[in-house]
């Protein structure tokens, strides 16, 4: 049994309010900001996490070349609109009626427009490239040890099925983790690569979303793996639509 039942907390999401008011007095947890019920045995969707983060008090918060269509999240934090399943709505707008289209990880994929902007569907991010630079160590990590440890991390901590970790590349001090998950591959109950990547990003920044206060302890053969820089590239099933003005800016 879990602490979520004993102490009524959510192991996988500290941005929740929990109480024993579920069926049969079971612990039920709701995400801050949205009030939506969350499943504490798995990751909470990035949309609900961003919404919770925006509702919280401000003081609480062989290498691959990314394709020309790869997106980087330059816009940063915003208060998103989530659908009833907790996914990002395809169209996001701010309080001043400026709107834009996002992909399944909530990253803007069009120019900003007004309320007349149409976003016909939520485009899936099917390939995520996580680019890390680790702090200096006595020597390079053994590539196969590093590969095995990162695959185990994503499987056990983030509950991501191993088939979605496509590759781990290493050229000291750069580590790249490739996550791939097409719409057709994702079964009911599978963790989304976008959610896993977001939890990993927050872990690496020392802002763990898990209940435990100690944060991530990642070691390769006993040697701590400490990251000093992270870049995440997102590739969508349909390329983004930006005007040439943005591309030349």
């Amino acid at each position: 049994h879990t602490a979520a039942q004993d102490n009524c907390t959510c192991p996988t999401n500290k941005m929740t309010v929990c109480s024993p008011d579920g069926p049969g007095g079971r612990c039920q947890c709701r995400a801050l900001g949205s009030g939506m019920a969350v499943d504490c045995s798995t990751l909470t969707s990035k949309c609900l996490l961003l919404k919770a983060r925006m509702s919280a008090p401000k003081n609480a918060r062989t290498l691959v070349r990314p394709s020309e269509h790869a997106l980087v999240d330059n816009d940063g934090l915003y208060d998103p609109d989530c659908d009833p399943e907790g996914r990002f709505k395809a169209r996001q707008c701010n309080q001043t009626s400026v709107c834009w289209c996002v992909n399944s990880v909530g990253v803007r994929r069009t120019d900003k427009g007004d309320l007349s902007l149409r976003c016909d569907e939520l485009v899936r991010t099917h390939h995520i490239l996580i680019d890390l630079r680790h702090r200096p160590t006595a020597g390079a990590f053994n590539h196969s040890d590093l590969d095995a440890e990162l695959r185990r991390l994503f499987r056990e901590r983030y509950r991501l099925h191993p088939k979605f970790v496509a590759a781990v590349h290493y050229e000291q001090p750069t580590i790249q983790i490739e996550l791939r998950q097409n719409t057709s591959q994702k079964a009911a109950g599978d963790v989304d690569i976008g959610d896993a990547a977001y939890y990993f990003e927050r872990d690496i920044k020392g802002e763990s979303l898990f209940q435990g206060r100690g944060g991530l302890d990642l070691r390769v053969r006993g040697e701590p793996l400490q990251v000093e820089r992270t870049l995440i590239y997102y590739l969508d099933e349909i390329p983004p639509k930006f005007s040439m003005k943005r591309l030349t800016a």
Partner: nanobody, 121 residues
Amino acid sequence: QVQLQESGGGSVQAGGSLRLSCEASGYTYSCMGWFRQAPGKEREAIANIYGGRTNYADSVKGRFTVSQDNARNTVYLQMNSLKPGDTAMYFCAAMWPYDRCGMDARDYVYWGQGTQVTVSS
């Protein structure tokens, strides 16, 4: 879902020894801790183990040893030089995988049902 089952508790004379076992099904790469709770007292962290690194509460240092057999998915607590003050219900617990190991019970996610240890003088 990780499930933990303790065994090895019982009654022993002061100065004696016991070895507790905690078998984990659905085992994950987690910090594993041993806790105890005497009647009317707070739950107390006594030892933990993670990746071969161990940590002990001052009250049991030098007397208790925590170890791990990954092939059997089992964590052990060898208790020597037992005292009447060690009488309590003993629990094993696991943190969420890859969480930094600690002694705070609130950081542990999975718990066993406990095994009783009674030390008489």
